[in-house]
Each structure stands twice: as structure tokens, then as C-alpha cells.
Interface confidence: medium
Amino acid sequence: AYRPSETLCGGELVDTLQFVCSDRGFYFSRPSSRANRRSRGIVEECCFRSCDLALLETYCATPAKSE
């Protein structure tokens, strides 16, 4: 199937998320506190259309703050 450049799907999406999120984990949909029910998930945003590093980073898990 045709995919425009700069789109990410499947294993390639997971691999890139691990890189962008520096192994700290990530969400496939943003936490509910940061988005409403109708917000897109990362597959829709990055596989069905193009996305950039800044958008990918919004799906990274938030690191715990130092005590």
C-alpha cells in the first residue's frame, strides 16, 4: 500500500518511538488529561499522515520528577 514519506507504521513506528522517547516509554494514545476523547492516536497521526519529531515526543511517557 502507498505510504507518503515521513509516515511511520508498525515496527518502524515502535522502533522510532523508542529512539525519540529515549527508552523511557510511550503511549499509543495521549493520556486523557492531555487530550479529549476525539483526539487522534499516534497510528492515525503518524502512520496515516506524516508526523515530525516534536509530535512524536508528545507521546513519550512523562519522566518522574526528581524528589
Partner: antibody, heavy 115, light 105 residues
Framework: QVELVESGGGLVQPGGSLRLSCAAS????????MSWVRQAPGKGLEWVSY????????GYADSVKGRFTISRDNSKNTLYLQMNSLRAEDTAVYYC????????WGQGTLVTVSS | DIVLTQPPSVSGAPGQRVTISCTGS????????VHWYQQLPGTAPKLLIY???KRPSGVPDRFSGSKSGTSASLAITGLQSEDEADYYC?????FGGGTKLTVLG
């Protein structure tokens, strides 16, 4: 045996362009993301750019965004870095590195930007 | 932004144990996987420790990594002259400033 061999470095004037190559062998090339990492003379390591294993996604350090372009040819097992609008601060040894953990590195190629 | 801080230099005599620290300043390093690289003089970096404490094949067990709180550490036991090198910690895209290890004598 995994081998990464960079080429294409040299002396270039400020504002000029250069294209680096990284030829890979000894592993399934199309299964690994790749990055370019650079090291200015006497300085530490700085990540420059990343490309996903199919080449669908690219990412850049802020210092090179809009000037450098990473690409790969999975039929030739080769990684590229097109560097435009070069500045003196881009002078460095440029390494290609495999995967998301940089588990293998090439020997590096020196890029000198000077008038 | 993530900042990883390493001591500029450490030293030790042959046979001794030395440690190199890597401290995260903007967020808890405990949530990240830390990798360590060794760069011998005039050569390319080499992966030494990945995912905090794992050793790639071929790396002697004299090298070990650990992580606690906001800091990660690389320990080298039974120091040898060939260990003299620069050592870098990283969280994937971000590298520490590097630590120069000098083996005395």
C-alpha cells in the same frame, strides 16, 4: 562481522556543501535504524541525525535542522548525509552508528569547514 | 532539555577500581535507559554498557554499569593501562560531556 565505513569528508568553505556516505556490511541493513553522530576536535559526542530502518522517518538536532538531510539506500546498504550551508562549527569527525543504542560505529570521516 | 553531567576526569592506579558518574539534571535519570561508550585515543566510540547494566559480547566483566535515583555509574575494576580512554554516558540522543580516564604509573 559488522562493518560501517564512512567516506566523503574533506575541506570545504563556509556556505559550501558536502555529502557523506556510510557503507554497511555484515548485518541485515534494512532492519536497523541509523544515525550520524559528530565530534568536534577535542570535544564530546553530539548526535546529528536519525533515520528509521525503512527510511520513512528522519530526525535532526536543532543545530543542523534545515541544513542537513539524512537518507538511506536499502538496495545499496548505504547511509548518506547531505550537508548544505556549512559553518565553521560543523567542523568535526562524523560517525555513522547503528540502531537506537549505537551498538556499532564507523571509523569516522573528518569534515573541515574553513576559508 | 535533558542534560547529562560527567566529571571531566578520573584517575586510578593499575589494579584499582574507579567509578564514573553520570547525573541527570532536568529529570529523573531513573526513568531512562543509560548507555556507556568507550573511546580509545584516536579511535571511534564503542558501546561498552547498554540499558544501564548490560554488557555487549566481548566486553570484559571488569566493566559494569548501575543506576540509582538521578545518577548512573560506570565501574571499572582491576584497572589496566589499556582502559585509558574517554568514557561517555548517553540517553540515546543525548550524550554526557565525557570523562577522561587516566591510568597512573
Amino acid at each position: 562481522q559488522v562493518e560501517l565505513v564512512e567516506s566523503g569528508g574533506g575541506l570545504v568553505q563556509p556556505g559550501g556543501s558536502l555529502r557523506l556516505s556510510c557503507a554497511a556490511s555484515g548485518f541485515t541493513w534494512s532492519s536497523f535504524a541509523m544515525s550520524w553522530v559528530r565530534q568536534a576536535p577535542g570535544k564530546g559526542l553530539e548526535w546529528v541525525s536519525y533515520i528509521s530502518y525503512l527510511g520513512s522517518y528522519t530526525g535532526y538536532a536543532d543545530s543542523v535542522k534545515g541544513r542537513f538531510t539524512i537518507s538511506r539506500d536499502n538496495s545499496k546498504n548505504t547511509l548518506y548525509l547531505q550537508m548544505n550551508s556549512l559553518r565553521a562549527e560543523d567542523t568535526a569527525v562524523y560517525y555513522c552508528a547503528r540502531g537506537t543504542k549505537f551498538d556499532y560505529w564507523g571509523q569516522g570521516t573528518l569534515v573541515t569547514v574553513s576559508s | 532539555d535533558i542534560v547529562l553531567t560527567q566529571p571531566p576526569s578520573v584517575s586510578g592506579a593499575p589494579g584499582q577500581r574507579v567509578t564514573i558518574s553520570c547525573t541527570g539534571s532536568s529529570s529523573n535519570i531513573g526513568t531512562y535507559d543509560v548507555h556507556w561508550y568507550q573511546q580509545l585515543p584516536g579511535t571511534a566510540p564503542k558501546l561498552l554498557i547498554y540499558s544501564n547494566s548490560k554488557r555487549p559480547s566481548g566486553v570484559p566483566d571488569r566493566f559494569s554499569g548501575s543506576k540509582s535515583g538521578t545518577s548512573a555509574s560506570l565501574a571499572i575494576t582491576g584497572l589496566q593501562s589499556e582502559d585509558e580512554a574517554d568514557y561517555y554516558c548517553s540517553i540515546t540522543r543525548v550524550f554526557g560531556g565525557g570523562t577522561k580516564l587516566t591510568v597512573l604509573g
